[in-house]
């Protein structure tokens, strides 16, 4: 009203020709014409808070956020961005208005967020809030959906800022656990952005376009369910919206729900309640806790209490950057030829990972399952008992993770032989890696029992075929054995396999293959 200073908030877009870092400034660069941001007094704020219309900026663009103050006398000011204070140098224009500017050069993701300007004048103190986000200009993107309260209605809107425009659907389930799997008959899908029926057991929103499908689950605490052994944990990045639903059912309406963060009631405007009668005339109440854009200080234990149920809590952790926590040490496994076995990786990650399993340069789809303790697990069982090296690779917007596995299949050796003018070689891929013996077949030893020890050269792991180790043994030809049949035998704990070779001319001459168990 007329007692308050007249505030004008403007955005100035600059032609990009500067490469220095963003700074608070009193003299902005040469630019395009200023855009009015309709500064409005924020309703029901403690203190005088003006908010500028939301600002969207292209990546690498340079802008100035500017405030013009029509108030008598001097002003002092302070900019605050992500809890850091930035200097502020007001000056006065030709109409004697106070001018305060914040220049952001070469806009990046880290410079997006809320900019607060605190102004102190001779008459009053007030705050101006600018919210700056990056315009999505990527060709094709698929972003994880997030929730927003429908403008002044008891309904949630599901939004996925993706290109091309994704198809958004709500995936609802009213039963517990395994029966809420995607293909289950208990699952109902609604291809719409707005959801009014918010009382269900499990609520997810999914967005899909040419790049695939991404889903976000509405984090829920159910006071009628036995609490998990470990406290449920919810991770969010700074600037993301927080939504937690607390649900309780009681025989009648005589109960209430409340949210607390670290034993302090949530501020009004950060929660809303809905209630309905179920088919058996019991009362269902849900209480949403929400923060439209979280900051570090929104971290903590959120507790939902009821006058008729034991309270339950969830730990909300706000991080600056996404992460993937898992042990990356390589793991070796040996299994029998028909043994059932799956590789598995247990990890904690935020945002949700995209992952692949790779074997022999071929990638396989990767499934993840959430565990009760906040960890997730990915299993790979489709190895078809092929020995070798398997790679698990995971990534999200901020982190990457790779883990190697070696699979060895216990089996009797199988021998392949080849001979040249100067030597004979035998190869085997059995596991455990076999040991070798060479024997000479002669009139004196028709059963080939005369052992050859001279000129033998064994090499374990001669070549690695996609992680599959091959053992070889080479016999150098000498006059003593030229023209004779020789037998190479590979043996391990599961058996022996032999190959007989005639040592008279080059070329492979597998003569007889013996399989001695």
């Amino acid at each position: 009203n007329q007692d308050l200073p007249v505030i004008k908030c403007v955005l100035i877009n600059h032609k990009n020709n500067d490469s220095s870092v963003g700074k608070s400034s009193s003299y902005p660069m040469v630019s395009e014409s200023p855009e009015d941001l309709g500064c409005a007094l924020r309703p029901q704020s403690s203190g005088t808070v003006y908010e500028a219309a939301a600002v969207e900026v292209d990546v690498s663009a340079s802008i100035t956020l500017q405030v013009l103050v029509d108030a008598p006398g001097n002003i002092s000011c302070l900019w605050v961005f992500k809890h850091s204070s930035l200097n502020c140098q007001p000056h006065f224009d030709l109409q004697n208005r106070g001018v305060v500017s914040m220049v952001i050069l070469k806009m990046t993701e880290t410079q997006a967020g809320e900019y607060l300007l605190f102004i102190q004048s001779e008459a009053t103190n007030y705050t101006i809030l600018f919210t700056v986000s990056i315009r999505n200009t990527l060709l094709y993107t698929l972003r994880r959906p997030y929730f927003r309260k429908m403008e002044n209605q008891d309904a949630l809107v599901c939004i996925s800022e993706s290109v091309p425009e994704p198809i958004v659907e709500w995936v609802l389930c009213d039963s517990q656990g395994e029966s809420c799997k995607e293909e289950s008959p208990a699952v109902v899908k609604k291809e719409e952005k707005v959801l009014h029926e918010l009382f269900g057991t499990d609520i997810r929103c999914c967005a899909r376009n040419e790049l695939g499908r991404e889903c976000t689950r509405l984090f829920t605490i159910d006071l009628n369910q036995t609490p998990q052994t470990t406290l449920p944990q919810l991770f969010l990045k700074v600037g993301e919206p927080l939504w937690i639903r607390c649900k309780a059912v009681h025989v009648n309406h005589g109960f209430g729900l409340t949210w607390e963060l670290e034993n302090k009631a949530l501020e009004e405007g950060n929660y809303f309640e809905m209630s309905t009668y179920s088919t058996n005339r019991t009362m269902i109440r849900i209480l949403f806790a929400f923060v439209s854009s979280v900051a570090r200080n929104d971290t903590g234990y959120y507790t939902c209490s009821s006058s008729k149920h034991p309270s339950q809590s969830a730990l909300v952790t706000i991080v600056e950057k996404g992460f993937i926590n898992a042990t990356n040490s390589s793991e070796d496994y040996e299994i029998d030829q028909y043994e059932e076995f799956c590789f598995s990786v247990r990890f904690k990650a935020y945002p949700q990972i995209r992952c692949t399993w790779t074997f022999s340069r071929k990638s396989f789809p990767c499934e993840q399952k959430g565990l009760d303790n906040g960890y997730s697990i990915s299993k790979f069982c489709n190895h078809k008992h092929q020995p070798g090296e398997y790679i698990f690779h995971a990534e999200n917007d901020d982190a990457q993770f790779t883990k190697m596995f070696t699979l060895n299949i216990r089996r009797k050796p199988q021998v392949l032989a080849e001979a040249s003018a100067s030597q004979a070689s035998c190869f085997s891929d059995g596991y455990p890696l076999p040991s070798w013996t060479w024997k000479k077949c002669s009139d004196k030893s028709p059963n080939c029992t005369e052992e050859i020890t001279e000129g033998v050269w064994n090499r374990k792991a001669n070549r690695k075929v996609f992680g599959q180790w091959v053992s070889s043994s080479t016999l150098n030809m000498s006059e003593a054995i030229k023209g004779f049949l020789v037998k190479c035998c590979a043996y391990n704990s599961l058996g022996t396999s032999c190959e007989t070779i005639l040592l008279n001319s080059p070329g492979p001459f597998p003569f007889i293959q013996d399989n001695i168990s």
Epitope: L11, S33, P34, E35, D36, L37, G38, A40, P43, Q44, E51, A52, A53, A54, V55, E56, A112, E114, T131, S133, R135, Y146, R148, K149, M150, E151, N152, Q153, I159, G239, E240, P241, S292, S293
Partner: antibody, heavy 127, light 107 residues
Framework: QVTLKESGPTLVKPTETLTLTCTVS??????????VSWIRQPPGKCLEWLAH???????SYSTSLKSRLTISKDTSKSQVVLTMTNMDPVDTATYYC???????????????????WGQGTTVTVSS | DIQMTQSPSSLSASVGDRVTITCRAS??????LAWYQQKPGKAPKRLIY???TVQSGVPSRFSGSGSGTEFALTISSLQPEDFATYYC?????????FGCGTKVDIK
């Protein structure tokens, strides 16, 4: 300074299509959730909200006139266009465009109605 | 759609009078209501938004109150320049809707 200026024919015949243009300055139609509404007022009668369009191309129309209205924008020209088909003498009115700033962040937008209006353009429907 | 009912449709008052205009919504709209003033031949001008927040530059004799379905605009001491028609607008859910106006004229 924010200004909105309506332009279009002052006279249209019944059954014809009316095309009105709102040219804006002092703010950008491409900025986050900045919107423009069309409102009309028949002579001596109430204000009637017709339609809006936001920077992300989100649109909404008056329920009773939905089938006849189309709203679009050309950000590069800073223009919002409203077309109304099958005009009738009862559509004689002053047509206004007005700005709707969207407040909030990446994830949560809210509105406080129209803050700045154009001066209006009078349209008469008569044969 | 949400219907907005304004009353009275017109009133006569003198300079210095305290004037109250009411607006009723057909369903709860929280505090998502704006008040506009319109003078003959001119475009409407926003006085109040969010039911009770006075637009910057608007005289402090104008005030708004209410929440849910019942709202009021009060002019504490009517001035000559306040003779005009006043409209309420719900900006709670689309389609937005106006009340049909209250004309304040000189007694």
């Amino acid at each position: 300074q924010v200004t909105l200026k309506e332009s279009g024919p002052t006279l249209v015949k019944p059954t014809e299509t009316l095309t009105l243009t709102c040219t804006v300055s002092g703010f950008s139609l491409s900025n986050a959730r900045m919107g423009v509404s069309w409102i009309r007022q028949p002579p001596g009668k109430c204000l009637e909200w017709l339609a809006h369009i936001f920077s992300n191309d989100e649109k909404s129309y008056s329920t009773s006139l939905k089938s006849r209205l189309t709203i679009s924008k050309d950000t590069s020209k800073s223009q919002v266009v409203l077309t109304m088909t099958n005009m009738d003498p009862v559509d004689t009115a002053t047509y206004y465009c007005a700005r709707i700033p969207g407040y909030g962040g990446n994830f949560y937008y809210h509105y406080y109605g129209m803050d700045v209006w154009g001066q209006g353009t009078t349209v008469t429907v008569s044969s | 759609d949400i219907q907005m009912t304004q009353s009275p449709s017109s009133l006569s008052a003198s300079v210095g009078d305290r004037v109250t205009i009411t607006c009723r919504a057909s369903q709860g709209i929280r505090n998502d209501l704006a008040w506009y003033q319109q003078k003959p031949g001119k475009a409407p001008k926003r006085l109040i938004y969010a039911a009770s927040t006075v637009q910057s530059g608007v005289p402090s004799r104008f005030s708004g109150s209410g929440s849910g379905t019942e709202f009021a605009l009060t002019i504490s001491s009517l001035q000559p320049e306040d003779f005009a028609t006043y409209y309420c607008l719900q900006h709670n859910s689309f389609p937005w809707t106006f009340g049909c106006g209250t004309k304040v004229d000189i007694k």
